[in-house]
């Protein structure tokens, strides 16, 4: 399970190889409190992957989920 | 360390299939890829699949497509690589390849590097008639 | 065809800097993937030598250093060494819907002259 303070789940590194997009249902940010700003996209199998927020492929998979 | 150990040298008829093994000792968890990457004599490397535990995924590249199938035994410690309708064109040697996909929230001490970082020793495959 | 272009070749004087270029598009590079580059000595398998554009694993010398902007990413040597005549080639991903793709460059022979 995640580890958290505050139960908000926090990532110290970050996915660099991008994961199909088919297999990515949701996306939540980490709280403003964790030390690094990062995405949690969550597959289909609902396992939860960090990811860089200010890679542009990750705001492109942010915005086709919005879209979705 | 991690250690992938492939099977032996094949040599093929133009036409027939090949399969070949990739055993990861301790097992290949779901934090990982698993990639074949061949390599032609004298030629560079090329990327042809890889096995994706993490969304139990398979993909292929576009030029293997229905040629190629890689697939894992029910352990999760070898993968395989068959490829079919071989031609003398696909002499080479064959590679597997590891490669951290998951990094999840919460502490990462157990956190290699990212990219292909484990790899298999290489198998040649000659295909000759 | 590669998708990553690298040249062909290069050659450096032992204790010189050679740098090693490698250029994508929009679709790769230029979407923010990261680049990774890797050594192949001759007879042997290829050996990860940086990772995530700039970042070196435990073992490899600080003489080799990467780079990356936009489109294209760069590996640098400095103070060249016998032992660094080999094949390089940088690596990087192309991703769809249903696809993660690794791609590689065409690879760069280092000669030591």
């Known amino acids: 399970s995640p580890y958290s303070s505050d139960t908000t789940p926090c990532c110290f590194a970050y996915i660099a190889r991008p994961l199909p997009r088919a297999h990515i249902k949701e996306y939540f940010y980490t709280s403003g409190k964790c030390s690094n700003p990062a995405v949690v996209f969550v597959t289909r199998k609902n396992r939860q992957v960090c990811a860089n927020p200010e890679k542009k492929w990750v705001r492109e998979y942010i915005n086709s989920l919005e879209m979705s | 360390q991690v250690q992938l150990v492939q099977s032996g040298a094949e040599v093929k008829k133009p036409g027939s299939s090949v399969k070949v093994s990739c055993k990861a000792s301790?097992?290949?968890?779901?934090?990982?890829?698993l990639s074949w990457v061949r390599q032609a004599p004298g030629q560079g490397l090329e990327w042809m699949g890889g096995?994706?535990?993490?969304?139990?995924?398979?993909n292929y590249a576009q030029r293997f497509q229905g040629r190629l199938t890689i697939t894992a035994d029910d352990s999760m410690s070898t993968v395989y690589m068959e490829l079919r309708s071989l031609r003398s064109d696909d002499t080479a040697m064959y590679y597997c390849?590891?490669?951290?996909?998951?990094?999840?929230?919460?502490?990462?001490?157990?956190?290699?590097?990212?990219?292909?970082?484990?790899w298999g020793q290489g198998t040649m495959v000659t295909v000759s008639s | 065809q590669s998708v990553l272009t690298q040249p062909s070749s290069v050659s450096g004087a032992p204790g010189h800097r050679v740098t090693i270029s490698c250029t994508g598009s929009?679709?790769?590079?230029?979407?923010?993937?990261?680049v990774h580059w890797y050594q192949q000595l001759p007879g042997s398998a290829p050996k990860l030598l940086i990772y995530?554009?700039?970042i070196r694993p435990s073992g490899v010398p600080a003489r080799f250093s990467g780079s990356k902007s936009g489109t294209s990413a760069s590996l640098a040597i400095t103070g060249l060494q016998a032992e660094d005549e080999a094949d390089y080639y940088c690596?990087?991903?192309?991703?769809?819907?249903?696809?993660?793709?690794?791609?590689f460059g065409g690879g760069t022979k280092l000669t030591v002259l």
């Open positions: 995530d554009n700039n």
């Open positions: 096995f994706i535990p993490l969304v139990d995924t398979t």
């Open positions: 690596q990087s991903y192309d991703t769809g819907l249903t696809s993660s793709d690794v791609i």
């Open positions: 390849a590891r490669e951290q996909v998951a990094v999840g929230p919460g502490p990462t001490s157990d956190r290699g590097p990212d990219g292909l970082d484990v």
């Open positions: 929009n679709s790769n590079l230029g979407a923010d993937y990261d």
């Open positions: 301790g097992g290949i968890s779901d934090n990982y890829a």
